[in-house]
Each structure stands twice: as structure tokens, then as C-alpha cells.
């Protein structure tokens, strides 16, 4: 993700306009306060994506953090996000407005917490006070977040001075909550199972010797009870586990499994839940598709990635032109499939220093006994243009014929240009483009051939010059998305005894 301007922090003048652009190889969007403000998304000509957030007539209320995130279906674990923070110093505002629920800060243990009084101007000095006592507290202040520290159960207020005016924030109320010291964790061997497979869920408590386990699970509704097994794992700290095991899962076993743990001696308790899905058959489904044509550049490495979801674990094969691919011993080709979550997979084909011969049709196939998917695309290898020859001939009719031949992928464009002043050519004088001129001084003919075995285009361009009355420097330039190449020749009139 690339944000322009890059940040990470901006201070804007009130009433100004500010434009933020986020660009990436995948669709992106701006988020503010976990929401999507109005923005203009676009796909650029080079295949990248961008989203433009225009903040017009900014006020202090626009102070805050802004995120650029991938607008994709991969979920947070594969999502990247970039943050910037904007200040709009607003002397009329002082502290940013807060909602009443944010003024009550509940602390569950002796950990750092934040009193989120924020100002619009990063230059302002902000102090924290107990409301009853007007002495500033020595707590670090972060202009983007507020005061960060450990706070007692008291009432607090933030203060700053704008000009010669002292400004107070809303009042913040800190409450410590006594919570259970029980540490419960629930995990399942698998949260997705096929009918007929087993469900095993463990509920583990650390550091407590006398605990009571109570399970709730979908089978209870139909009165079919499952007897959990309690497992004592002595050590430091001691662990007690309760294991719920259903050897043959049915579709109706899908749902929430909750483990409630209570300690009878002090009435402390805690519960954790986990969702299990029972499916009729296994599945494989693509989460993303690829463009039909993928581009690689000659001698550069290229990774092609397919993201899919499956259960049970599928086999993955890659094919090129219907032949199975495998990791090459020379390290020119690397295949990898990794499990990024319980049912999500990323399969990658990496072509190291791509060769022309690697162009072709590729297919990834993911399959198991129940289901299969495949994804196919054409790999185009782009090759820089080369001018292979620029030759000259003199037919008897007094014409000069120039023939320019070159190759490249994608198809090169040909441009002919000429320069008459040889001393100043071409550095000090712009060449004049040539083409099919109406005065019939020159005639241009271009033929294009696609060479299947080389997977590249050959361009042959012939330029006929009707009459040349003085020496000319003629340039043939080929150009494609990979670059350009050119050759020059000096053409002299038939009458001049002049050789290059």
C-alpha cells in the first residue's frame, strides 16, 4: 500500500482542502472511524488500483486517524492496512468532542489504559488533573491517543491553553472492575468437520485446582447428553482440562459449544465458546480469481498466487499446457501451498528469472474426494524490444529504401524520424517524425508477425524515400511497455560520394 503524500502525520490549515491517495496492486479503500467515507476509487492503466479521499474545507472535527485498507475478501489475517493521522488546529474546538459512553473507562486489571482526550493541534501542551485536585499528574501524553498510564478509581479532567484561554475537557470517570482470575481457553481439534467425523473440544483452566466445568452444546436441545472427560495435567502452573468428544458428528451438531468454569470457593467464573460447523460433504472453493492473462517480464521473477478455501485438506497440482509441474532442481520454478487458517490456503507458483519458454497456459487444480476447483490463465512473457537490423537499398528508380526489423513482446510500435542538420543531430535538434506524407515524399509500410515458438512479435517496417537531396540521419525506433530501442543510418543523395 502506498499513501501519497506519505505522512504518517499531517497538520492542515482550517478550511483547507487536502487530497489523500492510496494505491496498491489490489483494490483499496479509505476508512475513518471504522467506516468508509466518500472517496473515488479507480483502476489505473498500469493495472494498479487507487482510491482518492478529498477532505474539503477541513475543520477540527476532521482531526483523527485514517486507514487505507485492502478492499478484498481475504479477511483481516491477509489484509494490510496503513494508518495516517491528521491534525486540523481549530482554536474554537480545543478538545475533540466525545460521546458520553467514552467518558466512562472501565479497567479490569492493573494494566495501562488511555484517557482519550485529544486536541486538534499537536503543538498544544495538555495536562491531566484529578478533578478534585488542580495539580497536574505526571502521565505521558500522546497527541494522537491521549494520556496513557495506570489510573486509580477517580475522576479526571484534561486541560490545555489556547491563546490566553484555559480549556477543560469533559470529565472522565475511571472504574476498576474486579474480574475472575480464572484463565479459560477453549479449542477444537477442528472447527469444520464432515458428518461422520469426530468433534473434540478441549476446555483448559490454568492455575486453579478446584473447578467445576459445565458444557452447553447443540445436542443438549434434543436431550442427548455427552459425558465430558476431565483431564488433570499437573505441573507449574497446574492445568485442568475438560474434553468433550463426539465420535460421529451429525449435521445437527453444528453450533456453539460453550464451556463454563466456576470456582466454588470464591464464586469466580468464566466461560468461553467456540463454533463448530458440520458439513455434509467436503468442499473446495476459490476466494479470488485471477485475470485471464497474467504478465511476466523476461528475466524477472514472478509469483502467481491463488487463494482458496477447502475442507478436508486438498491436493494441489499446477499444470502448464496440460503438463504437470513440479519444483525444478535448478530452482527455476518453486511451487508452494500453505495453510493460512484452518480452511484457507494460498498456493503459489514462483517462476525465477522468467524465460520466454515459460509463456503458455497455466492451471492450478485443488481437489479431494468430495470436490475440486481449477483456475486457468495465460502467462504472457514480455520481452524488451530490439532493433535487429536497419538496412538501406538503392533501387534504380532513384528511391532510397530503408528496412527496419525488430522484435519484442508486447507488439512493438515503430516510429521513423529524420534529422537534416547532421552536426547538431540528434542531441541538439529534435528529429522530425516520418510517415505516409501527403506530398508523397515518403511511403511507409509495416508488417507484423507473431512467432509462436519465440512467443514474440517481429515487426518489419519499410520506409521509401522518393528523393533525397541532402544527407539525412534517419532513425528507426521500436517501443513497447518494456522499453525502447533504436538504430540510425545516414542516407545520402545518389549523387554524393559520401559513405557512413
Amino acid at each position: 500500500l502506498v499513501i501519497t503524500p506519505p505522512g504518517p502525520e499531517f497538520v492542515l490549515n482550517i478550511s483547507s482542502t487536502f487530497v489523500l491517495t492510496c494505491s496498491s496492486s489490489a483494490p483499496v479503500m479509505w476508512e475513518q472511524m471504522s467506516q468508509v467515507p466518500w472517496q473515488e476509487a479507480a483502476m489505473n492503466q498500469d493495472g494498479t488500483f487507487s482510491s482518492v479521499l478529498t477532505l474539503t474545507n477541513v475543520t477540527g472535527g476532521d482531526t483523527g486517524e485514517y486507514f487505507c485498507v485492502y478492499n478484498n475478501s481475504l479477511g483481516p489475517e491477509l489484509s494490510e492496512r496503513k494508518r495516517i493521522y491528521i491534525f486540523v488546529p481549530d482554536p474554537t474546538m480545543g478538545f475533540l468532542p466525545m460521546d458520553s459512553e467514552d467518558l466512562f473507562i472501565f479497567v479490569t486489571d492493573v494494566t495501562e489504559t488511555t484517557i482519550p482526550c485529544r486536541v486538534t493541534d499537536p503543538q498544544l501542551e495538555v495536562t491531566l488533573h484529578e478533578k478534585k485536585v488542580d495539580i497536574p499528574l505526571h502521565v505521558p501524553y500522546d497527541h494522537q491517543r491521549g494520556f496513557i498510564g495506570t489510573f486509580e478509581d477517580k475522576t479526571y479532567i484534561c486541560k490545555t491553553t489556547i491563546g490566553d484561554r484555559e480549556v477543560d475537557s469533559d470529565t472522565y470517570y475511571v472504574y476498576s472492575l474486579q474480574v475472575s482470575s480464572i484463565n479459560v481457553s477453549v479449542n477444537a481439534v477442528q472447527t469444520v468437520v464432515r458428518q461422520g467425523e469426530s468433534i473434540t473440544i478441549r476446555c483448559i483452566v490454568m492455575g486453579n485446582d478446584v473447578v467445576n466445568f459445565q458444557w452447553t452444546y447443540p445436542r443438549m436441545k434434543s436431550g442427548r447428553l455427552v459425558e465430558p472427560v476431565t483431564d488433570y495435567l499437573f505441573g507449574v502452573p497446574s492445568r485442568i482440562g475438560s474434553i468433550l468428544h463426539i465420535p460421529t458428528a451429525e449435521l445437527s451438531d453444528s453450533g456453539t459449544y460453550t464451556c463454563n468454569v466456576s470456582v466454588s470457593v470464591n464464586d469466580h467464573g468464566d466461560e468461553k465458546a467456540i463454533n463448530v460447523t458440520v458439513i455434509e460433504n467436503g468442499y473446495v472453493r476459490l476466494l479470488e480469481t485471477l485475470e485471464d492473462v497474467q504478465i511476466a517480464e523476461l528475466h524477472r521473477s514472478r509469483t502467481l498466487q491463488v487463494v482458496f478455501e477447502a475442507y478436508p485438506t486438498p491436493s494441489v497440482l499446477w499444470f502448464k499446457d496440460n503438463r504437470t509441474l513440479g519444483d525444478s532442481s535448478a530452482g527455476e520454478l518453486v511451487l508452494s501451498t500453505r495453510n493460512v487458517s484452518e480452511t484457507r490456503y494460498v498456493s503459489e507458483l514462483t517462476l525465477v528469472r522468467v524465460k520466454v519458454s515459460e509463456a503458455g497456459y497455466y492451471t492450478m487444480r485443488a481437489f479431494h474426494a468430495d470436490d475440486q476447483v481449477q483456475l486457468s490463465f495465460k502467462l504472457q512473457v514480455n520481452v524488451p524490444v530490439r532493433v535487429l537490423e536497419l538496412s538501406e537499398s538503392h533501387p534504380a528508380n532513384g528511391e532510397q529504401i530503408l528496412r527496419c526489423r525488430g522484435r519484442g513482446m508486447p507488439q512493438p510500435n515503430v516510429t521513423w524520424s529524420t534529422c537534416r542538420d547532421l552536426k547538431r543531430c540528434p542531441r541538439k535538434l529534435s528529429p522530425t517524425p516520418l510517415g505516409n506524407s501527403s506530398k508523397e515524399e515518403s511511403q511507409l509500410e509495416t508488417n507484423v508477425t507473431f512467432w509462436e515458438e519465440d512467443q514474440e512479435y517481429e515487426v518489419v517496417s519499410t520506409l521509401r524515400l522518393r528523393h533525397v537531396d541532402q544527407p539525412l540521419s534517419v532513425r528507426c525506433m521500436l517501443q513497447n511497455s518494456m522499453g525502447r530501442d533504436s538504430q540510425e543510418v545516414t542516407v545520402v543523395p545518389h549523387s554524393l560520394p559520401f559513405k557512413v
Epitope: 475513518q32 472511524m33 467506516q35 468508509v36 467515507p37 466518500w38 477532505l55 468532542p97 460521546d99
Partner: nanobody, 124 residues
Framework: EVQLVESGGGLVQIGDSLRLSCAAS????????MGWFRQAPGKEREFVAA????????NYADFVKGRFTISRYNAKNTAYLQMNSLKPEDTAVYYC?????????????????WGQGTQVTVSS
């Protein structure tokens, strides 16, 4: 400057439905996030529902979920609040608000423009 005008309020019985409209003029409506708030006599103004600039996402207060639906018709510069299964506690003046950044939050202080309000009374 954006002007917002609410309409569609009135007196209804418990369990009835009403549809409030909010007509906007003087701005680029399809860039604004739109929200509905309400204020009952003697109470603070409270958030009811909001909708993103493009209608893709919505935000509801817990007490109206499943009963009220917010929508918008950008071509007509209008936002709507469909209220079903009305209760006496829904009696209030309902205000329409617009956020020029396209946000759709429950935070009243984020909204830049407000309508005059329309009275909804649910009688028992």
C-alpha cells in the same frame, strides 16, 4: 449549504408503520452520509440509524434493530426511515442529519447539517 427537510411524521397506533422522508437540496447528496436521530420530551437526542454515502452499509441503534430500516435514493436526493411495529417509547421528534464526509456514525457531533425535525407520536 445543504438544506434538509423531513416529512412523513404523524400520529399512529401501537404496532403501526410510518415512513419518514428527508429531502436534501443544495449539495452533492450522493457524497453525504445520512443519519436519523430522535429526541423525546425531556430526554437527550439519541441516534436511531445511519447509512453510508453509497447505501452499501448501514448502522442502527440496538433499540430499533429489526423494526426500522434506513434507505436512500440518490437520484431523488432523499433518505428514508421505514418504521414498523411502533411502540409508545418511539414517540419523539425525528431529525435527519448529513455528514459531508460520507460517514454514517452514531455520533451526533460528526454531522454537519440538520433538518428541523418531524413529530412522530405513537398512542396507546
Amino acid at each position: 449549504e445543504v438544506q434538509l427537510v423531513e416529512s412523513g411524521g404523524g400520529l399512529v397506533q401501537i404496532g403501526d408503520s410510518l415512513r419518514l422522508s428527508c429531502a436534501a437540496s443544495g449539495g452533492t447528496f450522493n457524497r453525504y452520509g445520512m443519519g436519523w436521530f430522535r429526541q423525546a420530551p425531556g430526554k437527550e437526542r439519541e441516534f436511531v440509524a445511519a447509512i453510508r454515502w453509497d447505501g452499501v452499509d448501514t448502522n442502527y441503534a440496538d433499540f430499533v434493530k429489526g423494526r426500522f430500516t434506513i434507505s436512500r435514493y440518490n437520484a431523488k436526493n432523499t433518505a428514508y426511515l421505514q418504521m414498523n411495529s411502533l411502540k409508545p417509547e418511539d414517540t419523539a421528534v425525528y431529525y435527519c442529519a448529513a455528514d459531508r464526509r460520507g460517514l454514517y456514525t452514531k455520533h451526533a457531533h460528526r454531522y454537519d447539517y440538520w433538518g428541523q425535525g418531524t413529530q412522530v407520536t405513537v398512542s396507546s
